[in-house]
């Protein structure tokens, strides 16, 4: 199942994805693709990073977080209804079949016709249950023994609506996180 995120037409969408580098500067290649994560790589790649930088992207897709610290959350500028669908964030951990794959569902809603409120909502996130280690409430940590030396932490938030700026900021601490090393 996918975590679901929402944005309105004309706004920017934010799809969170995180990992923890084994050491500062030890970046892991990441790809973002439109469509569910396939067995290998990303289908319909919209952005890619390598051990050094962002080395491929298409128009309107960019990383607004600190990708050098493992924040590889995707920003999609000025979304349209056609941007709805599943997106894959793939952390390309060295080794056979070590990749971590996260499917995120983006739902685009038509723009409101009524006058915008004082504080505009950029996006909302909804999902019934979270796994987190970031101290934002009850947390579970799951270690996958099948992936050597990797602790997998999946992070999301319980938020039907982002009603205040604190929640908007907290969304940066949501998404999918893995620890490498």
């Amino acid at each position: 199942s996918e975590v679901e995120y929402r944005a309105e037409v004309g706004q920017n969408a934010y799809l969170p994805c995180f990992y923890t580098p084994a050491a500062p500067g030890n970046l892991v290649p990441v790809c973002w693709g439109k469509g569910a994560c396939p067995v290998f790589e990303c289908g319909n790649v919209v952005l890619r990073t390598d051990e050094r930088d962002v080395n491929y992207w298409t128009s309107r897709y960019w990383l607004n977080g600190d990708f050098r610290k493992g924040d590889v959350s995707l920003t999609i500028e000025n979304v349209t209804l056609a941007d709805s669908g599943i997106y894959c964030c793939r952390i390309q951990i060295p080794g056979i079949m070590n990749d971590e794959k996260f499917n995120l569902k983006l739902v685009i809603k038509p723009a409101k016709v009524t006058p915008a409120p004082t504080r505009q909502r950029d996006f909302t996130a909804a999902f019934p249950r979270m796994l987190t280690t970031r101290g934002h409430g009850p947390a579970e940590t799951q270690t996958l023994g099948s992936l050597p030396d990797i602790n997998l932490t999946q992070i999301s938030t319980l938020a039907n609506e982002l009603r205040d700026s604190r929640l908007a900021n907290d969304l940066r601490d949501s998404g999918a996180t893995i620890r490498i090393g």
Epitope: P24, R52, D53, N55, W57, W62, R68
Partner: antibody, heavy 121, light 107 residues
Framework: QVQLVQSGAEVKKPGASVKVSCKAS????????MNWVRQAPGQGLEWIGD????????KYNQKFKDRVTMTTDTSTSTAYMELRSLRSDDTAVYYC??????????????WGQGTLVTVSS | DIQMTQSPSSLSASVGDRVTITCLAS??????LAWYQQKPGKAPKLLIY???SLADGVPSRFSGSGSGTDFTFTISSLQPEDIATYYC?????????FGGGTKVEIK
């Protein structure tokens, strides 16, 4: 403390090659990319490329890729940048510089003193 | 390559003035902008990295803001020792590219 000490000024003829060295100390040489940046007289800064000493992986600015080679000697913590087929517009100060996140995610940024390369017939 | 457009190319201000320099990226670069100070005959010195973070040992009168494509560098109260040329640099996608520089002088 961290230091990057570069080789001395060079005067070269057009068509010749120059090899500039950069000796690093005060940090773990293999942990950070070594960048090379140049600055023509009275002009701005231009990135030439970088190399990661732990495996020799390098990335060059397309503008220089056919003429530049970057290498490192981890035994002496020294980086080298060789530029071939020199032209008069290669006259510049060449800097080595290393940057990136260090321990505790403190940003690490150090530059050599610069090496003036003059290309003249 | 990502182009960095810096403005103004030069400015003259009085001691104590607030000085603002802007840098515009041709494509979004997230937070990955650095600001350097360079004095004649010297290597560049890092002031700001990741758009807003002050480098170690840099006075707090220097600050940076912005993300995406639009960035601003501010000296809150210009001091005589701030006379230099300032460069922005993107560190989002190589080749790392610099702005054309802003020469700051005292009136």
């Amino acid at each position: 403390q961290v230091q990057l000490v570069q080789s001395g000024a060079e005067v070269k003829k057009p068509g010749a090659s120059v090899k500039v060295s950069c000796k690093a100390s005060g940090y773990t040489f293999t942990d950070y990319y070594m960048n090379w940046v140049r600055q023509a007289p009275g002009q701005g800064l231009e990135w030439i490329g970088d190399i990661i000493p732990n495996n020799g992986g390098s990335k060059y600015n397309q503008k220089f890729k056919d003429r530049v080679t970057m290498t490192t000697d981890t035994s002496t913590s020294t980086a080298y940048m060789e530029l071939r087929s020199l032209r008069s517009d290669d006259t510049a100060v060449y800097y080595c510089a290393t940057w990136g996140y260090g321990s505790s995610y403190r940003w690490f940024d150090y530059w050599g003193q610069g090496t003036l390369v003059t290309v003249s017939s | 390559d990502i182009q960095m457009t810096q403005s103004p190319s030069s400015l003259s201000a009085s001691v104590g003035d607030r000085v603002t320099i802007t840098c515009l990226a041709s494509q979004p670069i997230g937070i990955w902008l650095a600001w350097y100070q360079q004095k004649p005959g010297k290597a560049p010195k890092l002031l700001i990295y990741a758009a807003t973070s002050l480098a170690d040992g840099v006075p707090s009168r220097f600050s940076g803001s912005g993300s995406g494509t639009d960035f601003t560098f501010t000296i809150s109260s210009l001091q005589p020792e701030d006379i230099a040329t300032y460069y922005c640099q993107q560190l989002y996608s190589s080749p790392w590219t610099f702005g054309g520089g802003t020469k700051v002088e005292i009136k």
